[in-house]
Interface confidence: low
Amino acid sequence: NQDLPVIKCVLINHKNNDSSVGKSSSYPMVSESPEDLGCALRPQSSGTVYEAAAVEVDVSASITLQVLVDAPGNISCLWVFKHSSLNCQPHFDLQNRGVVSMVILKMTETQAGEYLLFIQSEATNYTILFTVSIRNTLLYTLRRPYFRKMENQDALVCISESVPEPIVEWVLCDSQGESCKEESPAVVKKEEKVLHELFGTDIRCCARNELGRECTRLFTIDLNQTPQTTLPQLFLKVGEPLWIRCKAVHVNHGFGLTWELENKALEEGNYFEMSTYSTNRTMIRILFAFVSSVARNDTGYYTCSSSKHPSQSALVTIVEKGFINATNSSEDYEIDQYEEFCFSVRFKAYPQIRCTWTFSRKSFPCEQKGLDNGYSISKFCNHKHQPGEYIFHAENDDAQFTKMFTLNIRRKPQVLAEASASQASCFSDGYPLPSWTWKKCSDKSPNCTEEITEGVWNRKANRKVFGQWVSSSTLNMSEAIKGFLVKCCAYNSLGTSCETILLNSPGPFPFIQDNIS
């Protein structure tokens, strides 16, 4: 079959840049390097049919399906998708190859399916088949990494059973505390599954794929550090692997480390030791306690002892299911308009939570910080002094937790007024909730001092679910006040605000706002 053309099928993934979306030029976006789709001849098919490797595309992603044809002379082409013919304009590249492209902007379900490209060259006719589907992210998972000992080596393997296959990296830090933050210069990252250097201060393994990034810290007791005020606690679920590292540094090698569970030495096969000399010729020893798959009876106090250091313990708690422990009672706060204030939730959880703060159906990112006592805290300060109901929601694989907060902002009332044929109403949102007075303005009372008491109906505060306290007062129109100006005033401990209304015909006619502090 010597007269068959040499063809190449490629997929070009585009990084969307919003300004170009929706434009129909051939190359509307920044592109990543093309991916070869193979394009093999399909056996046992009538006619010459090439089949490209299946293409999986994320929802809203933009791609180009491209065919490069190395055949003499001109070519003509036609795209067919779901029985509809689509325009096809071949052009030639610098190597004089025919180039045919199909740009799919912002992939949707309707754009998934089989794309057939019919090409006619001077020598022959042939068909190229592309199958494009939307990547099924419902099947995606991202699991927290866990550790295993490498067979016959003093090394740890980091495993994350995730789909798609994650990129695994070790995050190492030799400083203490704050300087081990992710972007600190003290942090070293190694994109590999096996780690041999196990003497660092802080060792974490992270796995990342399309769903995000999950990390697991190697739980460490450092006998050279002052123990935490509260006993460190490590939670695991039944079946998960347990790894605790005990680390100690001494001026010479004359010391040994041992692990005990509830005052009984760990069985051989459940620990291994490594040692090295540091730069200043001191000896560093580490002793790992590990259980490949924990059961309920692995719960208890694990104590690391040394002949030259005070021993330290950690409480390992094996649970059937994950949990989130925090007080879920609602909390109400009352603050001044410029007072600095943050909501905060203190919780204990396993596995680590994902959380959000919500106000008025809008979600805000949630940061969490570990405390020394085994609890974590999440604070929210970005309320911009808007009163209403704030919701903290946290969840992990096994539990969910929601806590409600109400924020009241102490402020002077602000009055809005409206009038109809039969009544005038005033509304105010101040806090504490305002009281109301109505006054009639007349020749006798040009300063509107004549109080109206009849026909006034004050409505109890109506608290909107996401909003703020609103109080209203309604004056029913009587002959005695028709045609007059009336003034409604709302007052609380922070001040008074008034609105003047002309009572003559339907429609709101507020025209003066008095602000009296």
């Epitope: 879920n328 009672s329 609602s330 109400d332 109901e389 969910q400 937790f401 929601t402 409600m404 608290r463």
Partner: antibody
Framework: QVQLVQSGAEVKKPGASVKVSCKAS????????MHWVRQAPGQGLEWMGI????????SYAQKFQGRVTMTRDTSTSTVYMELSSLRSEDTAVYYC??????????????WGQGTLVTVSS | DIQMTQSPSSLSASVGDRVTITCRAS??????LAWYQQKPGKAPKLLIY???SLQSGVPSRFSGSGSGTDFTLTISSLQPEDFATYYC????????FGQGTKVEIK
């Protein structure tokens, strides 16, 4: 143990209002949402609204907006549901029900015994 | 509002039978689904919450499954006290109930 005890049956005329009470005991009243659900004779269950007993904030089903008011009295651990402008199709058993997870995302784990409200001229 | 459609609306079964009731949501509700049992003249009783979690005190013959839009309540071996009406309910948004499935004696 957790108990929700509702007020007795009521017979009302069209246009009138009814106020049903639901007294809670056996748990911390302010830490669980309370819902109201009704069931017309021989019909299914219909959600009416929810109240947060701590802050008193409420959310009502669109259908009942403007006609229903849910309130609570923390001193007596009681929630109330008032339905105004009654019509014959409001004849139903009205239930209060506690939200299982102290958040509006779980199931209703404890229910009152129900209050039959009959609207008839 | 999200519509919940239960099927069948009624079924006849014998003691010891395996019974399956399905509930379909008009849009995805993740796992925010509960199942209730109601007997005549009584308040509903929570059986399953979060689509598959068994409420404490409920016999293990009751189980729930599903996520997104399609959910199932299964009674592995029907007992005399299980003849009742069963409702599903979503709490993903404004709570709504299915129309109910009546389980009767064959």
């Amino acid at each position: 143990q957790v108990q929700l005890v509702q007020s007795g049956a009521e017979v009302k005329k069209p246009g009138a209002s009814v106020k049903v009470s639901c007294k809670a005991s056996g748990y911390t009243f302010t830490t669980y949402y309370m819902h109201w659900v009704r069931q017309a004779p021989g019909q299914g269950l219909e959600w009416m609204g929810i109240i947060n007993p701590s802050g008193g904030s409420t959310s009502y089903a669109q259908k009942f907006q403007g006609r229903v008011t849910m309130t609570r009295d923390t001193s007596t651990s009681t929630v109330y549901m008032e339905l105004s402008s009654l019509r014959s199709e409001d004849t139903a058993v009205y239930y209060c029900a506690r939200d299982r997870a102290a958040r509006p995302r779980g199931g209703f784990d404890y229910w009152g015994q129900g209050t039959l409200v009959t609207v008839s001229s | 509002d999200i519509q919940m459609t239960q099927s069948p609306s009624s079924l006849s079964a014998s003691v010891g039978d395996r019974v399956t009731i399905t509930c379909r949501a008009s849009q995805g509700i993740r796992n925010h689904l509960a199942w209730y049992q109601q007997k005549p003249g009584k308040a509903p009783k929570l059986l399953i919450y979060a689509a598959s979690s068994l409420q404490s005190g409920v016999p293990s013959r009751f189980s729930g499954s599903g996520s997104g839009t399609d959910f199932t309540l299964t009674i592995s071996s029907l007992q005399p006290e299980d003849f009742a009406t069963y409702y599903c309910q979503q709490s993903y948004s404004t709570p709504t109930f299915g129309q109910g499935t009546k389980v009767e004696i064959k």
